[in-house]
Amino acid sequence: MNSNNKRAPYWTNTEKMEKRLHAVPAANTVKFRCPAGGNPMPTMRWLKNGKEFKQEHRIGGYKVRNQHWSLIMESVVPSDKGNYTCVVENEYGSINHTYHLDVVLVPRGSLEHHHHHH
């Protein structure tokens, strides 16, 4: 992008953001994505239930891949349930997108592959 062509943040791949409700079996991994662009390149931060999401807020913490605009939580547990909001911002503006995570307890002896949608 031309360095003179200043631009507020915008979503670059809304297809990957369509599924807002994630119902995930306990112990699985969940990934939330907010692919974005802008000039200067925006920064991304994450909120849980409207508050800053800190590593110490969950056992094992979480992973953020800035180049992939993603938040990853492994081995989810019921306390991970809630709303997760990505906030993408630069000096020209700010955009956000919220996902809802529900952690499903799968009974023992159920299907090995518990199908759910992202």
């Epitope: 670059t12 791949n13 995930v24 079996p25 699985n28 991994t29 990934k31 692919p35 992973k63 953020v64 891949r65 800035n66 180049q67 992939h68 605009w69 990853i72 492994e74 592959h113 518990h114 199908h115 759910h116 949608h117 992202h118």
Partner: antibody, heavy 119, light 107 residues
């Protein structure tokens, strides 16, 4: 054109250390995440580690966690893998690979360097 | 970690055959699935990324489909240069695990 060239492989005793390097050219190195992938003789591919373009994010396979360290020097366009406490099961060809932008698909690979751990 | 299971582990086919390889994930991985081809003594080559996108320069006889837990790599008409080992790889979780591979041999 994109090129990745690994070096630093060789024979090392169990418990020893080795540092692999991957020299990159033909692209803006700091814009891309890089990974190491290994392949034991006659076996399948095993992902080892990844590092983000600016070095801010790293992750490791459980099999190497605490023993291997991935790093990069963007001023030298070079990726590294420091391997400590080496075991016989670490014997493999080690490949460095570039991730596609916005996807963790490895679109370019080096030719590989062989690491042999044996007494 | 997320486990990837490929089937079959090997298959024999003839030039011109339609070949299908499947990959199953131990949990939903959305469309975060790549396919690679590897020939003896060579580095792997990316064929398909994000389940269904053909990598630049890869012949159109290769295609990928699926999402969630079940994925397929199809070679519509097998060519002599396609005899190789094929691997799937997930990149949904931080550890980008590969399937065990499928060897495509000449019948």
């Amino acid at each position: 054109q994109v090129q990745l060239l690994e070096s630093g492989g060789g024979l090392v005793q169990p418990g020893g250390s080795l540092r692999l390097s991957c020299a990159a050219s033909g692209f803006t190195f700091s814009d891309y995440a890089m990974s190491w992938v290994r392949q034991a003789p006659g076996k399948g591919l095993e992902w080892v580690s990844v590092i983000e373009g600016d070095g801010s994010y790293t992750h490791y396979a459980d099999s190497v966690k605490g023993r291997f360290t991935i790093s990069r020097d963007n001023s030298k366009n070079t990726l590294y893998l420091q391997m400590n406490s080496l075991r016989a099961e670490d014997t493999a060809v080690y490949y460095c690979a570039r991730e596609k932008t916005y996807s963790s698909a490895f679109d370019y690979w080096g030719q590989g360097t062989l690491v042999t751990v044996s007494s | 970690d997320i486990q990837m299971t490929q089937s079959p582990s090997s298959l024999s086919a003839s030039v011109g055959d339609r070949v299908t390889i499947t990959c199953r994930a131990s949990q939903d991985i959305s469309s975060d699935l790549n396919w690679y081809q590897q020939k003896p003594g060579k580095a792997p080559k990316l064929l398909i990324y994000d389940a269904s996108n053909l990598q630049s320069g890869v012949p159109s006889r290769f295609s990928g489909s699926g999402s969630g837990t079940d994925f397929t790599l199809t070679i519509s008409s097998l060519q002599p240069e396609d005899f190789a080992v094929y691997y799937c790889q997930q990149h949904y979780s931080p550890s980008h695990t590969f399937g065990q591979g499928t060897k495509v041999e000449i019948k």
